[in-house]
Amino acid sequence: KKVVLGKKGDTVELTCNASQKKNTQFHWKNSNQIKILGIQGLFLTKGPSKLSDRADSRKSLWDQGCFSMIIKNLKIEDSDTYICEVENKKEEVELLVFGLTANSDTHLLEGQSLTLTLESPPGSSPSVKCRSPGGKNIQGGRTISVPQLERQDSGTWTCTVSQDQKTVEFKIDIVVLAFQKASSTVYKKEGEQVEFSFPLAFTLEKLTGSGELWWQAERASSSKSWITFDLKNKEVSVKRVTQDPKLQMGKKLPLHLTLPQALPQYAGSGNLTLALEAKTGKLHQEVNLVVMRATQFQENLTCEVWGPTSPKLTLSLKLENKGATVSKQAKAVWVLNPEAGMWQCLLSDSGQVLLESNIKVVPTW
């Protein structure tokens, strides 16, 4: 007996071939011997089966001795043994229809779990193997669970259902709702304008929700809400903003915030949260601001940074075109009685300059 696997909602062709390449009498029945379709003259006739309105046959192939039955919009309960009677012989085809669906919405927040459930006909014992867009393989039986979704799980999941050495493939599109980056750091000289951007890692037709940026300044004892906003159909509107600093926010996506001036008192870490309508939980992105200041006071040239810096970062003071350099893995460096000339303050990570500030030291007479 031939076994054919089908997908719920799909269309399947059950083949039946005759040796003579001409129109001949044929009909298809189910396991209860109820006629589904057949031929009368040149006409296709339908029987009393519940399948009849979804069953068809390809007339132009009859001349080739091919008397296939096509079943549209497959249902799990269409799983059965079908009998094709042609040229005084019977061909049996066992059809097994499977369905694979996500238990919840396929738009899930990062960190949430995904469960895929297999619908299968009674008596079948299928196995399921799913591959994520990132190449992660997960195996299971009736259910497949992914406990904590990551950004890279967004995309088309390909799941293969196997039964009786036959396979059928399902494709399920999963959208992980997250920001493109978990964390980002902006490095600025004191006084410069600061741009924070929070691009999303997904697109939705309608995007509605609300968000807030909480800020923990390095110098402050507690965090403070800098701005709250609403998102309606991808349009951003500010609800409330602090007076100091007076942030500005772009009206369109991606979410974009502007701090007019980078000042040491603003250096620190922020957490932007976005709650989407009809979704439980929030999207998060951490943002850090590092501010540099180079000053000369009397005989002391100082370079300082504020904000979250890694201990492996190097802060240096260097006289342009000269060898004179002072470097430290610290948040401040200084030179006493500096030589006249253009000094550079550099914040670097393994030789890569993250931030640079120049200060001119004039000769003292």
């Epitope: 997908k7 909602g9 799909d10 269309t11 399947v12 062709e13 003259g41 040149l42 006409f43 068809d56 390809r58 007339k59 132009s60 001349d63 096509i70 079943i71 549209k72």
Partner: antibody
Framework: QVQLQQWGAGLLKPSETLSLTCAVS????????WSWIRQPPGKGLEWIGE???????NCNPSLKSRVTISVDTSNNQFSLKLSSVTAADTAVYYC?????????WGQGTLVTVSS | DIQMTQSPSSVSASVGDRVTITCRAS??????LAWYQQKPGKAPELLIY???SLQSGVPSRFSGSGSGTDFTLTISSLQPEDFATYFC?????????FGGGTKVESK
């Protein structure tokens, strides 16, 4: 909703090979046949040929020697190649889904053969 | 090959008119016939299949009849959006063939 999106070169020189691809989305790919039909400017429709998901083809005998139809089931796509084109092959080429009748069509691609 | 002959090749009509187009098959094709509507610059659209079954979403003013060799497409009350070219197609045997088309234009 089933959609067929087709693409390919629109301007060819005589003796070149016409090449078109059609991508199917939003519906079943197996169980149906996938056809190519053409329509010369201001004229009627001519069936070129068809293929199913397992690669079984049927072609119009008038074009069979020049036609190659192939299928890429992993991407739900099928393609047409028509070799040694002449000005008589200038037409709008359509891809379509067929069981007995053509119920979904691509947008059409005008292919002009000119020296 | 099965020959499909459509008549007339064009018909002039007014909104509200009853329009009839015929298609003759040679040889007999039972009820393996479809009707399509095509507007300029667009792909054809299936109206009627199996000679008399109305395709989902098609207005009920369109109807099909006939069997064997002679078939008819009727538009009971012509609407402004019905001015187009109509084709018949046989699905009885390969090669699948179409009629030459009937253009319904405004009187």
């Amino acid at each position: 909703q089933v959609q067929l999106q087709q693409w390919g070169a629109g301007l060819l020189k005589p003796s070149e090979t016409l090449s078109l691809t059609c991508a199917v989305s939003g519906g079943s790919f197996s169980g149906y046949y996938w056809s190519w039909i053409r329509q010369p400017p201001g004229k009627g429709l001519e069936w070129i040929g068809e293929i199913n998901h397992s690669g079984s083809t049927n072609c119009n005998p008038s074009l069979k020697s020049r036609v190659t139809i192939s299928v890429d089931t992993s991407n739900n796509q099928f393609s047409l190649k028509l070799s040694s084109v002449t000005a008589a092959d200038t037409a709008v080429y359509y891809c379509a889904r067929v069981l007995n009748y053509f119920d979904y069509w691509g947008q059409g691609t005008l292919v002009t053969v000119s020296s | 090959d099965i020959q499909m002959t459509q008549s007339p090749s064009s018909v002039s009509a007014s909104v509200g008119d009853r329009v009839t187009i015929t298609c003759r098959a040679s040889p007999d094709i039972a009820n393996w016939l479809a009707w399509y509507q095509q507007k300029p610059g667009k792909a054809p659209e299936l109206l009627i299949y199996a000679a008399s079954s109305l395709q989902s979403g098609v207005p009920s003013r369109f109807s099909g009849s006939g069997s064997g060799t002679d078939f008819t497409l009727t538009i009971s009350s012509l609407q402004p959006e019905d001015f187009a070219t109509y084709f018949c197609q046989q699905a009885n045997s390969f090669p699948l063939t179409f009629g030459g088309g009937t253009k319904v234009e405004s009187k």
